[in-house]
Amino acid sequence: SEVEYRAEVGQNAYLPCFYTPAAPGNLVPVCWGKGACPVFECGNVVLRTDERDVNYWTSRYWLNGDFRKGDVSLTIENVTLADSGIYCCRIQIPGIMNDEKFNLKLVIKPAKVTPAPTRQRDFTAAFPRMLTTRGHGPAETQTLGSLPDINLTQISTLANELRDSRLANDLRDSGATIRIG
């Protein structure tokens, strides 16, 4: 069953997904979709990367981390209850039936009414947006040859630990690793 993640209305939700490129610049296409991963591709695509850059994204959906190092975790800005549901992170490893598919369940809770708003963590301060991950940064100049020559060594995704978007700083320590090969 899919791993569950939580965020409050008005927060930024964080859905973790990682892989390890075999070498710098040897990126693998990734897609994020709303809904469980289908047999092929992603349904209802909200963001997609190619071998060089983020080549498609929709409003409120962006990559926060360094996707060129394999951090393809999805951030959803200012979530509402309608953002609840299952999301698919698909790491599109070249070759037949090689894709790694991860279904992540996002549960949106009503915003808490708190008398001390200063005690709330500023999520976006902890994770400032990187414009380069939204398709406006410099493109990789390396030209990939045959895609199947990419030798992925690892696919990583968070397994069980993250239960609230405000724990995102602890994200890296919670990852389960899947080896390809």
Partner: antibody, heavy 116, light 107 residues
């Protein structure tokens, strides 16, 4: 208007070969996965094969693997199904369809009859 | 493979009435399910995808619901042109599979 037109069906003996063609129009062919789905006479639908846009990946149902080959030609906006070592159970109407997971639209179909 | 079972095999309904068609998956397919309509001698036509999203040009009287293993196609007020065979199809698990179909006939 999006349109798919199949051709190449006919009567063939067991063990024989046929090549089906599907001509696409009304959309950017190179941007889409294309699929073949078949329907035996009076029976239900069975997904047969599909090809990823650009042709880098091709997938087949087990019953045709090693006998059928799907291919595409972006210059001709066409997808093909080469069928070898045909068997009686391959008798069906073969439909070409756009899409990888769900299929829309479909061509009108072409009948393949495998019989001696 | 994921077996898709449709019920009933034949459904007799009068024009203007509601028709409810069922589709059950042998394992979860989440919401990765489509519905098609096929009239005699014609190719199938996509009605619904993602379990509940109507395809382009499909009238609002067609609606889909369900997730996991249980799905329903509802036609709220049957028109004469709606009498046909209906197929469900899952695209969550390999390989893609269809149900055996439900024939909707005039009562």
């Amino acid at each position: 208007e999006v349109q798919l037109v199949e051709s190449g069906g006919g009567l063939v003996q067991p063990g024989g070969s046929l090549r089906l063609s599907c001509a696409a129009s009304g959309f950017t062919f190179s941007s889409y996965w294309m699929s073949w789905v078949r329907q035996a006479p009076g029976k239900g639908l069975e997904w047969v094969a599909n090809i990823k846009r650009g042709g880098s990946e091709r997938y087949y149902v087990d019953s045709v693997k090693g006998r059928f080959t799907i291919s595409g030609d972006n210059a001709k906006n066409s997808v093909y199904l080469q069928m070898n070592s045909l068997r009686a159970e391959d008798t069906a109407v073969y439909y070409c369809a756009r899409g990888s997971n769900w299929f829309d639209p479909w061509g009108q179909g072409t009948l393949v009859t495998v019989s001696s | 493979e994921t077996v898709m079972t449709q019920s009933p095999a034949i459904l007799s309904v009068s024009p203007g009435e509601r028709a409810t068609l069922s589709c059950r998956a042998s394992q979860s397919v989440y919401s990765n399910l489509a519905w098609y309509q096929q009239k005699l001698g014609q190719a199938p036509r996509l009605l619904i995808y993602d379990a509940s999203t109507r395809a382009t040009g499909i009238p609002a009287r067609f609606s889909g619901s369900g997730s996991g293993t249980e799905f329903t196609l509802t036609i709220s007020s049957l028109q004469s042109e709606d009498f046909a065979v209906y197929y469900c199809q899952q695209y969550n698990n390999w390989p893609i599979t269809f149900g055996q179909g439900t024939r909707l006939e005039i009562k």
